[in-house]
Interface confidence: low
């Protein structure tokens, strides 16, 4: 069974978390977005979403990067910094962000009821919207065998974590990995939770 927690869409960009923890590889992220009739957002698309109110406290894939969008400074989220944070060492599993080009240009909180591009498969997939509504379907979206049959069978049991790295600026972005948390192998969010993604300072 796979639970997919999704947020509202902001200029088409939304956050997806699998099984309440960081548990999505880059290849699975692309497949997952495709199943949502979406793609991995570009940095420009993420910045647009940020500009109209999209923020999370979870690392997720976009095209070429792993990021957290932050609007409001929060001492326990990205050390009070704001902007699109890029994780410099992306060797783990994370959540993902997706971009749906046909979504409204502003905020869209209507419920997502299915994975329109999922194909036939045996997996029970539950879509959990931010308001708690749940929609269940059978199917599959993963195409990479390594995502379907992970080498570490305990990944689905892993808890969340934190990340910490020193921050520096480059190219207009702040490169940041959390300080005071774990790298979660996963959780429920734009959401920091108790599952596995702390990334320590370097």
């Amino acid at each position: 069974q796979i639970d997919l927690n999704i947020t509202c869409r902001f200029a088409g960009v939304f956050h997806v978390e699998k099984n309440g923890r960081y548990s999505i590889s880059r290849t699975e992220a692309a497949d997952l977005c495709k199943a949502f009739n979406s793609t991995l957002p570009t940095m420009a698309q993420m910045e647009k979403a940020l500009s109209i109110g999209f923020e999370t406290c979870r690392y997720g894939f976009i095209e070429g990067h792993v990021v957290i969008p932050r609007i409001h400074p929060n001492s326990i989220c990205a050390a009070n910094n704001t902007g699109v944070y890029i994780l410099t060492s992306n060797t783990s599993q994370y959540d993902t962000y997706c971009f749906n080009a046909s979504a409204p240009p502003e905020e869209d909180c209507t419920s997502v009821t299915d994975l329109p591009n999922a194909f036939d498969g045996p997996i029970t997939i539950t879509i959990v919207n931010r308001d708690g509504t749940r929609y269940v379907q059978k199917g599959e979206y993963r195409t990479n065998p390594e995502d379907i049959y992970p080498s570490n069978p305990t990944d689905d049991d892993v808890s969340s974590g934190s990340s910490s790295e020193r921050s520096s600026t480059s190219g207009g972005y702040i490169f940041y990995t959390f300080s005071t948390v774990h790298p979660i192998p996963d959780e429920d969010s734009p959401w920091i939770t108790d599952s596995t993604d702390r990334i320590p300072a370097t």
């Epitope: 406290c57 959390f178 959780e187």
Partner: antibody, heavy 118, light 112 residues
Amino acid sequence: EVQLLESGGGLVQPGGSLRLSCAASGFTFSLYRMRWVRQAPGKGLEWVSSISPSGGITEYADSVKGRFTISRDNSKNTLYLQMNSLRAEDTAVYYCALDVGVGAADYWGQGTLVTVSS
Amino acid sequence: DIQMTQSPLSLPVTPGEPASISCRSSQSLLHSNGYNYLDWYLQKPGQSPQLLIYLGSNRASGVPDRFSGSGSGTDFTLKISRVEAEDVGVYYCMQALQTPWTFGQGTKLEIK
């Protein structure tokens, strides 16, 4: 400043019920996973339950599964623990804690004492 | 469930001297992402627990650098380079690899 304030503890008879609350302030409550951890008098720490930011995912220790229910009201910035069919061994100080990452409980409340006795 | 075992359970230390606490898990806490899901907490007398070390070796915000964590897999160590009076309390290790999160029995550090 992050603050977590537990309430609802007290004396209850075996088999009784109690609802603990944890009022959160100083951070964006709806973004974070929360948990309950307890400590029996003179004993060590025991994880009780966790809940994801939206409340969609909950987890429980085997010792409380089926008896305790964790929930949250993000509009009220409040975490709850509904405890039913209480037993003497549930006697403990119950802490709510904010998770800021994998398993990390960086902020804890001051705790509320639950005493189960006849 | 993953079992956590700490030693010693009691640790009398002279101020200024080093201290070391061991924590062993019943199965490896090393995740495939390269991180060890092991935390250390300190509970001072009459207070709530506070996070000292996360992911085996990373100091939480505000924790003095005299505290350090090390180890990998199933064997971990918390070291205090020079114990101060304010360090008294009970130290707990906790595995965060999988639920149920489990704690060690605790090590009570006291000043000689």
